[in-house]
């Protein structure tokens, strides 16, 4: 038998259980937590990854100013409800019957309520701004080299179509990556910008979701690009609905 047959694993998601019980002895993988079958040739949805994580044992400036409607994920980890396609359900509730509405990246976009709270639709996050600060280097990175390498990273590692990387801004030491993907632009089989951003966030934190014990090795013209801070802003197609009380807190 071949070496590949020895290696029944999921390249794009280490939080899976795999066995060669697919058609013709093909390797088939299921996500931890949900037991859902995953396509290991592409990214797993953020909802299934969060579910798997919760089931695992505990352990003249060119920079963009985020809009007033931009969301930051302050709530952190929770055990989400995912639909049969692995997307977040619009309404999420915890064990104490506290509920809230989320966007397509699973970030809360309303005040918390009770079981009577209605979330009519899953609102799409169509614009993601990834704000990075890199560690000091001998000199600034060449902007065009940095731009090209980050675009290549999102294309090759995260399988995100280049048209969804809208811009890369750089003012040493701050790098901003803008991802844009409207509902109408996303075709079947396209990686979702929210999933790509989540994989990137985990990579930057040294928590790679890809198979094996390795991590992200990102270099610009051979010079390692090491990130010391990350902030991610999410913009939805419909602005979030929070009470004034939260906005003044």
């Amino acid at each position: 038998h071949t070496a590949a047959q020895d290696n029944c694993t999921c390249p794009t998601n280490k939080m899976t259980v795999c066995s060669p019980d697919g058609p013709g002895g093909r390797c088939q993988c299921r996500a931890l937590g949900s037991g859902m079958a995953v396509d290991c040739s592409t990214l797993t949805s953020k909802c299934l990854l969060l579910k798997a994580r919760m089931s695992a044992p505990k352990n003249a400036r060119t920079l963009v100013r985020p809009s007033e409607h931009a969301l930051v994920d302050n709530d952190g980890l929770y055990d989400p409800d995912c639909d049969p396609e692995g997307r977040f359900k619009a309404r999420q509730c915890n064990q104490t019957s506290v509920c809230w509405c989320v966007n397509s990246v699973g970030v809360r976009r309303t005040d918390k309520g009770d079981l009577s709270l209605r979330c009519d639709e899953l609102v799409r996050t169509h614009h993601i701004l990834i704000d990075l600060r890199h560690r000091p280097t001998a000199g600034a990175f060449n902007h065009s080299d940095l731009d090209a390498e980050l675009r290549r990273l999102f294309r090759e590692r995260y399988r995100l179509h280049p048209k969804f990387v809208a811009a890369v801004h750089y003012e040493q030491p701050t790098i901003q990556i803008e991802l844009r993907q409207n509902t109408s632009q996303k075709a079947a089989g396209d990686v979702d910008i929210g999933d790509a951003a989540y994989y990137f966030e985990r990579d930057i934190k040294g928590e790679s979701l890809f198979q094996g014990r390795g991590g992200l090795d990102l270099r610009v013209r051979g010079e390692p690009l090491q990130v010391e801070r990350t902030l991610i802003y999410y913009l939805d197609e419909i602005p979030p609905k929070f009470s004034m009380k939260r906005l003044t807190a």
Epitope: P11, E156, R157, F210, G214, G215, D217, R219, G222
Partner: nanobody, 125 residues
Framework: QVQLQESGGGLVQPGGSLRLSCAAS????????MGWFRRAPGKGLEGVSV????????YYADSVKGRFIISRDNSKNTLYLQMNSLRPEDTAMYYC??????????????????WGQGTLVTVSS
């Protein structure tokens, strides 16, 4: 995915040399860690050598240190393994492997996602 095709295997006498090549298709080759693995008859898969995308880091199994040299030519999408001072215990099927793009890798097969079909190396007098 990247397609990998090994070549250069064959029969060689103890003390002799061989050079294995691995041709990779796909534009992602130059951002992948690449490795050579082998399986001797009746044995498990063993990591032989690994090289980083820029070729600035290399790793070798103790059993081949000082005898084997791994190298790569990113302009030709090709990985090499120069095998010198070959011994009968080097007899095995040799496989070329690639990590996921931009992913670091070690001599552990779990770090690699794409594999070639292998080329047979026989060291015998």
């Amino acid at each position: 995915q990247v397609q990998l095709q090994e070549s250069g295997g064959g029969l060689v006498q103890p003390g002799g040399s061989l050079r294995l090549s691995c041709a990779a298709s796909g534009s992602t080759y130059s951002r992948r860690y690449m490795g050579w693995f082998r399986r001797a008859p009746g044995k498990g898969l063993e990591g032989v050598s690994v090289i980083s995308p820029y070729g600035d880091s290399t790793y070798y199994a103790d059993s081949v240190k000082g005898r084997f040299i791994i190298s790569r030519d990113n302009s030709k999408n090709t990985l090499y393994l120069q095998m010198n001072s070959l011994r009968p215990e080097d007899t095995a099927m040799y496989y070329c492997a690639a990590s996921w793009p931009y992913q670091t890798a070690s001599l552990d097969a779990m770090d690699f996602t794409d594999w070639g079909q292998g080329t047979l190396v026989t060291v015998s007098s």
